[in-house]
Structure formats: structure tokens, C-alpha cells
């Protein structure tokens, strides 16, 4: 809370204006000398996308000119801390986390874009952003409060490929059955006519309930 | 300069009260966490109070409900309010602010002390 | 209450020399990845002055004589080469859980 600018109860400065001169020297040499204590922001709960996918923000008052940042990500649950994954960035530079990592992110200034991918219902706790100024000297430690994230696992649903192979030997089933059934009525119809007789084709009324709205041909004989 | 001066020590009988201030000056007193710590006759060092600038106090078991620590924003001042005195309470206190290399959820260390003021409980 | 144990009580060591320290705590000290100790010496008549902080860490302004070290609950301090400015006691304190505490000190001698 030390910092000018970043703690709750700021300074209440009721300087005349005569005094500027004083109050940019007291800012000039006491900021550098007080600001130091590195605060870490952190959102308070995030909720995680159905694809397991959560991604908050991490900023801390860097109370210097930081060069070489790390960020650590810890998960505490049940009083025990574990390391999520970490990154140590120049600054102006890309984040960049081990490759089998479930961390990705981004930095723009102050501030670290956190993604975590992979998250399942018990992955369920609270995540903390830890931020370390590594270079130069002196060497500062924040930890943010934690962002709670819940992960809700989506409904149970049957693996993508098996379905498509059901869904083929449904379609293969019924076209050979509407082919075996054609095949069938067509070797009926055959043998019931004569291969002299002349017919025509007329529209009966539906057998079937009035629901289907399909006519079917019947073959009539002519004599 | 940043400094710290604490005054208010002196003979106290058991029972009694006495209350300790701490002037900063080269810094705003507000801004910072502040504590109180001792330094018994064994020379064993004792955190006796904390005041964060959010205005919440921590105190251990050891003086929890005697002492009290508040603090006066326009005067820059820093005091510690010592009631129901006991003999352990005789030590030579020392007011300090928190080191700034640090930020989080755990407890205080000191970068910044006072010269002290000695406190004796005797009857 | 974490109790931190300083040794030895006392330590006389040659000018030029390298001076070691020690202190162990009932507990582990490590939270979040790190060592929450710090190290301060105090000179007769002085009040303590913060010397190391979180295990490793020196106070911008002390000597690249003083080094410290550890993790958990072993953690010691360094002074190679000592000098005559070095005469103290030295304490160690922890703040990974309430109530902080500090531990008994080392004091230094020189022979």
C-alpha cells in the first residue's frame, strides 16, 4: 500500500499554489523513494466457457522501470498452492509459456491477459496471479487475491465420430430396405399383369390414415 | 528524511495504562502499513501491533483486548494504547513501517524503525 | 506459533573471515512459490535494520557481503568477508502465518 496513486487512503495535499515548486520536488524525489509496494489486481470470480476456457486479467503497479517480469499462476484449493504455469517476459515482448502449457496470454504494459485452457468441474478454485520483478534490482514480489473460477462441465454427449457412424448405418439400413421394398412391389406388380393388356393409372383414395397425405398409384387392368 | 520518533515510554504499574506515540515525518504515516514492535530486557524482539491504511488492526493473543493502535491522519502520528499493563509488558517499543518489497496476503516486515521508547511495568 | 531457532547464540569470527548463521523454523515458512524470511541486524543501542528479505533479497544499499539462503525451513545468513561494521546481533523473522515472529539472534563477534 505504499505506492502513491495505488493505495486506498490517498495523501490529502492542501498546498497553496505558491507551493508548487515544493510539491513538484516532493513528487520528484519521494515518489521514486515511496512508491515501491507492487499491488496486484486481479478479477474476483470468472466463470469458465462450456469448452473449459477461462481468461481474466492480471495488472500490478510496477513501482519501477521492470525490464524482466515473471508470472506465475497458482491454484489454491483445500489450503494447498499449486503452480498452474509460468512465464518470464521482456517487456514489450511476447508472453511466452512452456509448450505443454495450459496457460496462454498476452502483455500490454502493466497488465498480463491470462488464458487457461482445459479446465473441468474439478478444476474448480481459486486462481492467483503471482508477478515477480526479476530485473533490475530491486527484485519485487506481488500476489493478487485470486480470481475464483468455476468450471461447469457441459452435459455428456456421445463422441462426434460415433455418431456419424451411427447415423450412416441408419441411412445405409433404410435405403436398402426402401430399395428391397421397391424391388419387391415392382416383382409383384410384374406377375400380375399381362404382357398384352394396355392399362391406365388412376388416383384412389388414401388407405392409409388421412395424416400421411400420400396417394399411391394401384395398377387396373383394362379388358 | 524518512523518519520515525517514539515518545510516551515510561514507569507504569501493573494494571495501569499508558499510551505510546510514534511522529513520521519524510513520508504520509497513512499511506503505509504501520506496527509497533518490542524489545524485551532478554533482547527477544515481540510484534505487539499492526494498522493497515485501509484502517484494520491485527494484534496477537498476547495483548489482543489490552492494547489498542489508532492513529491520527492530520498529525501524521501513530499511537498505541496500553491498558491492564502486566510485567511481561516491559520492553523498550519500537514503532516501524512496512517494507515496500512486498505486496500480498501475508504479514509485515519492517524497513523503517524508530529509535524506541522504553515501557516499565513494575509495582 | 511458528517458532524460528537461531544458531549459534553467539559467533566469533576473525576479520576477513566468512561468518555463518542459522535459523530453523518449527515449520515450514513457503507460501506461494516463496520463503517468507527476512534477516536484520542490529548494532548496540540501534534499533534492528532490515538486512535481507524474502530469503534472498538484499536491501538495496546493504553490501553484496551479506548473502542469504534457504527454503522451507532451513535458512541461513552469510557474511564473506566479515569487517569491523559487522558486530551485531542478527535476527531472523517470518511472516508466512499470524503472529509473525522473529527469532532469538546470533550475535557477532569479532576476534
Known amino acids: 500500500m505504499a505506492c502513491l496513486g495505488f493505495q486506498r487512503h490517498k495523501a490529502q495535499l492542501n498546498l497553496a499554489t505558491r507551493t508548487w515548486p515544493c510539491t513538484l520536488l516532493f513528487f520528484l524525489l519521494f515518489i521514486p523513494v515511496f512508491c515501491k509496494a507492487m499491488h496486484v489486481a486481479q478479477p474476483a470470480v470468472v466463470l469458465a466457457s462450456s469448452r473449459g476456457i477461462a481468461s481474466f486479467v492480471c495488472e500490478y503497479a510496477s513501482p519501477g522501470k521492470a525490464t524482466e517480469v515473471r508470472v506465475t499462476v497458482l491454484r489454491q484449493a483445500d489450503s494447498q498452492v499449486t503452480e498452474v504455469c509460468a512465464a518470464t517476459y521482456m517487456m514489450g515482448n511476447e508472453l511466452t509459456f512452456l509448450d505443454d502449457s495450459i496457460c496462454t496470454g498476452t502483455s500490454s504494459g502493466n497488465q498480463v491477459n491470462l488464458t487457461i485452457q482445459g479446465l473441468r468441474a474439478m478444476d474448480t478454485g481459486l486462481y492467483i496471479c503471482k508477478v515477480e520483478l526479476m530485473y533490475p534490482p530491486p527484485y519485487y514480489l506481488g500476489i493478487g487475491n485470486g480470481t475464483q473460477i468455476y468450471v461447469i462441465d457441459p452435459e455428456p454427449c456421445p463422441d462426434s465420430d460415433f455418431l456419424l457412424w451411427i447415423l450412416a448405418a441408419v441411412s445405409s439400413g433404410l435405403f436398402f430396405y426402401s430399395f428391397l421394398l421397391t424391388a419387391v412391389s415392382l416383382s409383384k406388380m410384374l406377375k400380375k399383369r399381362s404382357p398384352l393388356t394396355t392399362g391406365v393409372y388412376v388416383k384412389m383414395p388414401p388407405t392409409e390414415p388421412e395424416c400421411e397425405k400420400q396417394f399411391q398409384p394401384y395398377f387396373i387392368p383394362i379388358n | 528524511e524518512v523518519k520515525l520518533v517514539e515518545s510516551g515510554g515510561g514507569s507504569v504499574k501493573p494494571g495501569g495504562s499508558l499510551k505510546l506515540s510514534c511522529a513520521a515525518s519524510?513520508?504520509?504515516?497513512?499511506?503505509?502499513?504501520m506496527s509497533w514492535i518490542r524489545q524485551t530486557p532478554e533482547k527477544r524482539l515481540e510484534w505487539v501491533s499492526s494498522?493497515?491504511?485501509?484502517?484494520?488492526?491485527y494484534f496477537p493473543d498476547s495483548v489482543k483486548g489490552r492494547f489498542t493502535i489508532s492513529r491520527d491522519n492530520a498529525r501524521n502520528i501513530l499511537y498505541l494504547q496500553m491498558n491492564s499493563v502486566r510485567s511481561e509488558d516491559t520492553a523498550m517499543y519500537f514503532c516501524?513501517?512496512?517494507?515496500?518489497?512486498?505486496?500480498?496476503?501475508?504479514?509485515?516486515?519492517?524497513?523503517?524503525w524508530g529509535a524506541g521508547t522504553t515501557v516499565t511495568v513494575s509495582s | 506459533n511458528i517458532v524460528l531457532t537461531q544458531s549459534p547464540a553467539s559467533l566469533a569470527v576473525s576479520l576477513g573471515q566468512r561468518a555463518t548463521m542459522s535459523c530453523r523454523a518449527s515449520?515450514?515458512?513457503?507460501?506461494?512459490?516463496?520463503?517468507?524470511i527476512y534477516w536484520y541486524q542490529q548494532k548496540s543501542g540501534q534499533p534492528p535494520n532490515l538486512l535481507i528479505y524474502?530469503?534472498?533479497h538484499l536491501k538495496p544499499g546493504v553490501p553484496a557481503r551479506f548473502t542469504g539462503s534457504g527454503s522451507r525451513t532451513d535458512f541461513t545468513l552469510t557474511i564473506d568477508p566479515v569487517e569491523a561494521d559487522d558486530a551485531a546481533t542478527y535476527y531472523c523473522?517470518?511472516?508466512?502465518?499470524?503472529?509473525?515472529?522473529f527469532g532469538a539472534g546470533t550475535k557477532l563477534e569479532l576476534k
Open positions: 516501524a513501517r512496512k517494507g515496500p518489497y512486498y505486496y500480498g496476503p501475508r504479514g509485515w516486515f519492517f524497513d523503517v
Open positions: 519524510g513520508f504520509t504515516l497513512s499511506n503505509f502499513d
Open positions: 494498522f493497515t491504511p485501509d484502517g484494520n488492526t
Open positions: 515449520e515450514s515458512v513457503e507460501g506461494y512459490g516463496t520463503s517468507f
Open positions: 524474502l530469503t534472498s
Open positions: 523473522q517470518q511472516n508466512n502465518e499470524d503472529p509473525l515472529t
